[in-house]
Interface confidence: low
Amino acid sequence: QSSLTPLMVNGILGESVTLPLEFPAGEKVNFITWLFNETSLAFIVPHETKSPEIHVTNPKQGKRLNFTQSYSLQLSNLKMEDTGSYRAQISTKTSAKLSSYTLRILRQLRNIQVTNHSQLFQNMTCELHLTCSVEDADDNVSFRWEALGNTLSSQPNLTVSWDPRISSEQDYTCIAENAVSNLSFSVSAQKLCEDVKIQYTDTKM
């Protein structure tokens, strides 16, 4: 039997991940082979209750590899190059069960920032141009802007007009997320527009 759809597993750069293995209930396991991108990673022969025979066949990942009692693979100090396809073949006397995994290594998001390019018009309407960013962003990061629980934009950029005469105080929140972390940063339209107003007044004097 084989599991055709790989299990998607997310790992955090520099941290550890476990690829969970379920072995066939009630069957004696003769050996387990773990593969990474179709090359042998480790070969396990159940040997004693506490210490199976473990042959690590990939020296590159070897020191970062460990196995649980149920033969699940643990990989520590994750690197971007650990991204890829992992397979475990569990061999019993009568069958071989295949489990497939896709490991994706993601960075923990850090340092969310919002930059503001705003302008004040003669009618006192304030136009906010907000851009959200995180350190080392990649394709796995998504951004969205929210106000009062409503999504205003699914982009890092947001442009809004704010009129202090008719708008109540309003916070705009940028949310940056990937599969392993999320960050948010809120800005006050009133505060930003006041700052612009001060600058505007200064330049007029």
């Epitope: 379920e22 069957e27 004696k28 396991v29 209750t49 506490k50 006397k93 009568t94």
Partner: antibody, heavy 117, light 106 residues
Framework: QVQLVQSGAEVKKPGASVKVSCKAS????????IEWVRQAPGQGLEWIGV????????NYNEKFQGRVTLTADKSISTAYMELSRLRSDDTAVYYC??????????WGQGTLVTVSS | DIQLTQSPSSLSASVGDRVTITCQAS?????IYWYQQKPGKAPKPWIY???NLATGVPSRFSGSGSGTDYTFTISSLQPEDIATYYC?????????FGQGTKLEIK
């Protein structure tokens, strides 16, 4: 240290059901299979079935298929064996056992189930 | 089902004797496992994967065999070895046990 503690003796009437519990401690419950074995008075050992507490996956001796249900509650590290439509020849000591790499390494103390009208 | 036939069913021997129990499978099996059971107690793992002694088992015990024929040996019987011994196989569901061999002191 590893321990499997089973529920107490039961007396049941033919046709009834019995549910035996097996509480595990001293190890990661979901990392090992739990097997169930019975032994009729003065007789040998008979394998009933196995459960993987992590996934809930089971495998039964066909002889008991349809009459036995193995379950596990991960939150309290307890496995259960329920046997229905009891007959007098189901009178036995029922054991739970942990499977290490490939053998029963720790056993419960056994639960005597007596089926009598 | 794979039948496991142990012989003898019971055995009386003297302290210091060499004792041999056989376990014959009705078809080839990969390994045989042996358990020791004392009256009123749960079985204990004794020999796993045909010839490996479980933790705490004295070295006077040994196991051997392949295919359908397996042997369990005590090189020098001791009073504490008095028990019933069962063989077991994992190859096919149902995972069967032999009927047991009861060991007694003469």
């Amino acid at each position: 240290q590893v321990q499997l503690v089973q529920s107490g003796a039961e007396v049941k009437k033919p046709g009834a059901s019995v549910k035996v519990s097996c509480k595990a401690s001293g190890y990661a419950f979901t990392n090992y299979l739990i097997e169930w074995v019975r032994q009729a008075p003065g007789q040998g050992l008979e394998w009933i079935g196995v459960i993987n507490p992590g996934s809930g996956g089971t495998n039964y001796n066909e002889k008991f298929q349809g009459r036995v249900t193995l379950t596990a509650d991960k939150s309290i590290s307890t496995a259960y064996m329920e046997l229905s439509r009891l007959r007098s020849d189901d009178t036995a000591v029922y054991y739970c056992a942990r499977r290490g790499w490939d053998y029963f390494d720790y056993w419960g103390q056994g639960t005597l189930v007596t089926v009598s009208s | 089902d794979i039948q496991l036939t142990q012989s003898p069913s019971s055995l009386s021997a003297s302290v210091g004797d060499r004792v041999t129990i056989t376990c014959q499978a009705s078809q080839d099996v990969s390994y045989i496992y042996w358990y020791q059971q004392k009256p009123g107690k749960a079985p204990k793992p004794w020999i796993y994967r045909t010839s490996n002694l479980a933790t705490g088992v004295p070295s006077r015990f040994s196991g051997s065999g392949s295919g359908t024929d397996y042997t369990f040996t005590i090189s020098s019987l001791q009073p504490e070895d008095i028990a019933t011994y069962y063989c077991q196989q994992w190859d096919n569901n149902p995972y069967t046990f032999g009927q047991g061999t009861k060991l007694e002191i003469k």
